[in-house]
Interface confidence: medium
């Protein structure tokens, strides 16, 4: 069981792990799942230009401002 199993065992998340080092230019589409009934953490699923889907860390520097804008309507703080 991964880290999510202990913390989030009551809930169901899409992402079991995140992929590091993905270049933004490789991404064709981004889905952001806010905390909700299904999962107690923010999840980011990226569709890549090669057809694969991966999970990204919402804290990744190139994503952070985008995620904040989506979740907080432009608020700067996380």
């Amino acid at each position: 069981a991964g880290p999510a199993a202990a913390v989030l065992r009551e809930l169901r998340c899409v992402c079991l792990q995140t992929t590091q080092g993905v270049h933004p230019k490789m991404i064709s589409n981004l889905q952001v799942f806010a905390i909700g009934p299904q999962c107690s953490k923010v999840e980011v699923v990226a569709s890549l230009k090669n057809g694969k889907e991966i999970c990204l860390d919402p804290e990744a520097p190139f994503l952070k401002k985008v995620i904040q804008k989506i979740l907080d309507g432009g608020n700067k703080e996380n």
Epitope: A6, P37, N75, E77, N78
Partner: antibody, heavy 119, light 107 residues
């Protein structure tokens, strides 16, 4: 700017109940978890429970089941904690806090609400 | 419940000194460890989360390290504003549990 504004100090009698509020601003209330923490002198910090303010999910420490009830009013972006059957052991400062991007850490804290239980 | 053993319980250090506080979990918490600073009569302030990540607005002299059961918070060069009590928190398993705290004072 993220802010959590808690209600003021309360002096209450043993056996009664109290409700503490935590008004959130500066972010989308329903996108994060709100946690409640108890602090008594000499006892450090103790997790009471948390709730997903978008509705439906509330978790409690075994120590606070039957003692604390956590609710939220999304229309006013306010979280509440109701404590019942108060004793001197419940005299403490109670903090609310907002999660980061998941439940596992507390990014922003309220200023605390002092509850004193005394006859 | 997971027990967090924090040490030392209190310490004093000189300005500019390197300070390290440790927390040991009773079992593997997989880096679900955060650190908080609290000054008297104030609410806690988040310093570090996921064991190593610096929270927004926290000076770079603070850093976190560790994995598995053993974690530490380091202040690379102590400043007067750093006198406070420091707490670790594990959220690897419910319920989350705090360490007992480390009171840091200036020599």
């Amino acid at each position: 700017q993220v802010q959590l504004q808690q209600s003021g100090a309360e002096l209450v009698r043993p056996g009664t109940s109290v409700t503490i509020s935590c008004k959130a601003s500066g972010y989308t209330f329903t996108n994060y978890w709100i946690v409640w923490v108890k602090q008594r002198p000499g006892h450090g910090l103790e997790w009471i429970g948390d709730l997903y303010s978008g509705g439906g999910y509330t978790f409690y420490s075994e120590n606070f089941k039957g003692k604390a009830t956590l609710t939220a009013d999304t229309s006013s972006s306010t979280a509440y904690m109701h404590l019942i059957s108060l004793t001197s052991e419940d005299s403490a400062v109670y903090f609310c806090a907002r999660s980061g991007y998941d439940r596992t850490w507390f990014a922003h804290w309220g200023q605390g609400s002092l509850v004193t239980v005394s006859a | 419940d997971i027990k967090m053993t924090q040490s030392p319980s209190s310490m004093s250090a000189s300005l500019g000194e390197r300070v390290t506080i440790t927390c040991q979990a009773s079992q593997d918490i997989e880096s679900y460890l955060s650190w908080y600073q609290q000054k008297p009569w104030k609410s806690p302030k988040t310093l570090i989360y996921y064991a190593t990540r610096l929270a927004d607005g926290v000076p770079s002299r603070f850093s976190g390290s560790g994995s598995g059961q053993d974690y530490s918070l380091t202040i690379s060069s102590l400043e007067s504003d750093d006198t406070a009590t420091y707490y670790c928190l594990q959220h690897g398993e419910s319920p989350p549990t705090f360490g007992a705290g480390t009171k840091l004072e200036l020599k």
